[in-house]
Interface confidence: low
């Protein structure tokens, strides 16, 4: 028993005076509090709790359920408490079934005895299985039986509180562990698309996906630089033990170029927080630019290839495109394509293939491509790189010698003389006129130009070689010519074409 | 079997032309992109640029830009790493390596590549 | 340009689980492949596509990319494993990256 200091308010004291009393079922069980400030009696087992504002508490007829801590007040706040333990055989264990344990902490598995004189107060597996090696346990026949450190590996754990009465062993009511994880990472948050592009008033809705061991993770979507509270919709499931996933789903119904901007999905545990963004482009209509890849001036050689290649950015989706050249829409020899697979792709490809092109192929070649919103052109020249040919060469009737040659790029016509027999034609001569003719083709046609020298100016027998050349070849006409007497004889012109 | 093989080991002085080559086989050369990966002595993998030698349209790193040409050889399934005027900073080892079939320029994943060719510069 | 940042080394015991992260701004948005280097050899193909498998590469390679962080997970780690290991993705201008590369070390 307490006792008691003169001046300094002190505990009640209770009779019986020990701190555990043990009744048999059925027996009376009556316990007095004495104390002039006297205010309750409590009773508490498991979660239950009772209270008796008699100074004297009495059960007539004990059950096991009258098992428990009894404590008596006074009015200065101080107490005193006894254990009553009421043996029943039939009812060895007071349960409360649930149990629930958070991961690396101690949890009781409330099994509180009714008899503390029973012996090898234990835990057992259910159905003879045995418990995880590593488990620890502290029985306390007032409380229960303590787990140490409870794991992961534990959840869903069958268990029984044990005793051995008489020499038989006797089994509570089954417990069923569930072990709520501890955060041991941060949430793993992911977003749908990293980035939307969108015309106004299209909806925008984006899905952040948050994983976690439980569903205790917090989760929100806030725009940066902004704490308006944005409006989201959940899904969730657990996909098997400590697997957890939310969707959080945020929509803009109809967006605005004003909303555009960056998303954050952010989730945080015990442990830490993560983050994911989204960007969001609204424009208030549709685009299209296009990407020449290579010059838009083209200069090809005559019977080869190339290739006329666009990229272009077109968003909505393109829906027409075309390549025409002469006011005729090629049906075949082009294709055009997505510059990725992404879903959120807006770059595509395409090609035009010029195959084995003629000198009369050059010209503008037009890639035409539109969308709901916009049409977009771009357009290629290409010059075809030709041989010169010599068109004509003649002998006029004022004496002078006349060499006409067409090619592209423009041909440069040289004039040499040969005397004699001889083969080379080195001595140059200078043309006494030189123009460059309007072809009848088309502008990205071969161009024209005619030269003429007078043959007056050779005095001895030999021949006149007119040479025609450009970057791509050159080709060569002969004038022989020979003297009888005074007088030149006719001429015969013929052509040699070098390549 | 798909198989890309390289032009041997060069050493060469500064400022000297020099051009290395991959010729695949076992394989449609043309519908493939080829890129070119450099790795320094000790150091990690570098992108050089890439090339569809079915027309030759080609994208380089822009840290590669101007300093090296790549090119192709459809008719005989042979892409090409040149360079007009070496430094002695451009001793490596060069790979090209083939994107698998399905991918496509966006995805790169190269998923053959060449046994390598090591160039020295030095004078 | 996408900038990939690799932990320059990464150890693990064998049979256990190696991870091998590649971060980079937003790289989740786009795929991610990995490649196997051994000391005198050409690299060879682990991962493509985030987390596809080339025939011939075994199980215990997997992959996965989300938000700015792609990662290799080698389950199981084998003596062979010993390698340096690069990741490589594709930024919008179709220009190809890779990582700095990470040495894995099997004690």
């Known amino acids: 028993q307490p006792s008691v200091s003169p001046g300094e308010p002190s505990p009640p004291s209770i009779h019986p005076g020990k701190s555990d009393l043990i009744v048999r079922v059925g027996d009376e069980i009556r316990l007095l509090c004495t104390d002039p400030g006297f205010v309750k009696w409590t009773f508490e087992i498991l979660d239950e709790t009772n209270e008796n504002k008699q100074n004297e508490w009495i059960t007539e007829k004990a059950e096991a359920t009258n098992t428990g801590k009894y404590t008596c007040t006074n009015k200065h706040g101080l107490s005193n408490s006894i254990y009553v333990f009421v043996r029943d055989p039939a009812k060895l264990f007071l349960v409360d079934r649930s149990l629930y344990g958070k991961e690396d902490n101690d949890t009781l598995v409330r099994c509180p005895l009714t008899d503390p004189e029973v012996t090898n107060y234990s835990l057992k597996g259910c159905q003879g299985k045995p418990l995880p090696k590593d488990l620890r346990f502290i029985p306390d026949p007032k409380a229960g039986i303590m787990i140490k450190s409870v794991k992961r590996a534990y959840h869903r754990l069958c268990l029984h509180c044990s005793v051995d009465q008489e020499g038989k062993s006797v089994l509570s009511e089954k417990f069923i562990l569930k072990v709520r994880p501890a955060f041991k990472a941060v949430p793993v948050v992911s977003v749908s698309k990293a980035s939307y592009l969108l015309r106004e008033g299209e909806e925008f809705t984006v899905t952040c996906t948050i994983k976690d061991v439980s569903s205790s993770v917090y989760s929100t979507w806030k725009r940066e630089n902004s704490q308006t509270k944005l409006q989201e919709k959940y899904n969730s499931w657990h996909h098997g033990d400590f697997n957890y996933e939310r969707q959080a789903t945020l929509t803009i119904s109809s967006a605005r170029v004003n909303d555009s901007g960056v998303f954050m999905c952010y989730a945080n545990n015990t442990f830490g927080s993560a983050n994911v963004t989204t960007t969001l482009e609204v424009v208030d209509k549709g685009f299209i630019n296009i990407f020449p890849m290579i010059n838009t001036t083209v200069f090809v050689n005559d019977g080869e290839n190339v290739d006329l290649i666009v990229e272009y950015e077109a968003f909505p989706k393109p829906e027409h495109q075309q390549w025409i050249y002469m006011n005729r829409t090629f049906t075949d020899k082009w294709e055009d394509y997505p510059k990725s697979e992404n879903e959120s792709n807006i770059r595509y490809v395409s090609e035009l293939h010029l195959t084995r092109l003629k000198g009369t192929e050059g010209g503008t070649y037009t890639f035409l491509v539109s969308n709901s919103d916009v049409n977009a052109a771009i357009a290629f020249n290409v010059y075809v790189n030709t041989k010169p040919e010599i068109l004509t060469y003649d002998r006029l009737v004022n004496g002078m010698l006349q060499c006409v040659a067409a090619g592209f790029p423009e041909p440069t016509i040289d004039w040499y003389f040969c005397p004699g027999t001889e083969q080379r034609c080195s001595a140059s001569v200078l043309p006494v006129d030189v123009q460059t003719l309007n072809s009848s083709g088309p502008p990205f046609g071969k161009l024209v130009v005619q030269s003429s020298i007078d043959s007056s100016a050779f005095k001895h027998n030999g021949t006149v070689e007119c040479k025609a050349y450009n970057d791509v070849g050159k080709t060569s006409a002969y004038f022989n010519f020979a003297f009888k007497g005074n007088n030149k004889e006719q001429i015969h012109p013929h052509t040699l074409f070098t390549p | 079997q798909v198989q890309l093989v390289q032009s041997g080991a060069e050493v060469k002085k500064p400022g000297e032309s020099l051009k290395i080559s991959c010729k695949g086989s076992g394989y449609s050369f043309t519908n493939y992109w080829i890129a070119w990966v450099r790795q320094m002595p000790g150091k990690g993998l570098e992108w050089m640029g890439i090339?569809?030698?079915?027309?030759?349209?080609?994208l380089y790193s822009p840290s590669f830009q101007g300093q090296v040409t790549i090119s192709a050889d459809k008719s005989i399934s042979t892409a090409y790493l040149q360079w007009s005027s070496l430094k002695a900073s451009d001793t490596a080892m060069y790979y090209c390596a083939r994107v698998p079939p399905g991918g496509s320029i966006s995805y790169p994943a190269f998923d053959h590549w060449g046994q390598g060719t090591l160039v020295t510069v030095s004078s | 340009d996408i900038e990939l940042t690799q932990p320059p080394s990464v150890s693990v015991s064998p049979g256990q689980t190696a991870s091998i992260t590649c971060s980079g701004d937003n790289i989740g948005s786009i795929y991610a492949s990995w490649y196997q280097q051994k000391p005198g050899q050409a690299p060879v193909l682990v991962i493509y596509r985030d987390n596809k498998r080339p025939s011939g590469i075994p199980e215990r390679f997997s992959g996965s990319n989300s938000g700015n962080t792609a990662t290799l997970t080698i389950s199981g780690t084998q003596a062979e494993d010993e390698a340096d290991y690069y990741c490589?993705?594709?930024?919008?201008?179709?220009?190809?990256?890779f990582g700095g590369g990470t040495k894995l070390t099997v004690l």
């Open positions: 490589s993705v594709t930024d919008m201008e179709q220009h190809s990256v």
């Open positions: 090339i569809y030698p079915s027309n030759s349209y080609t």
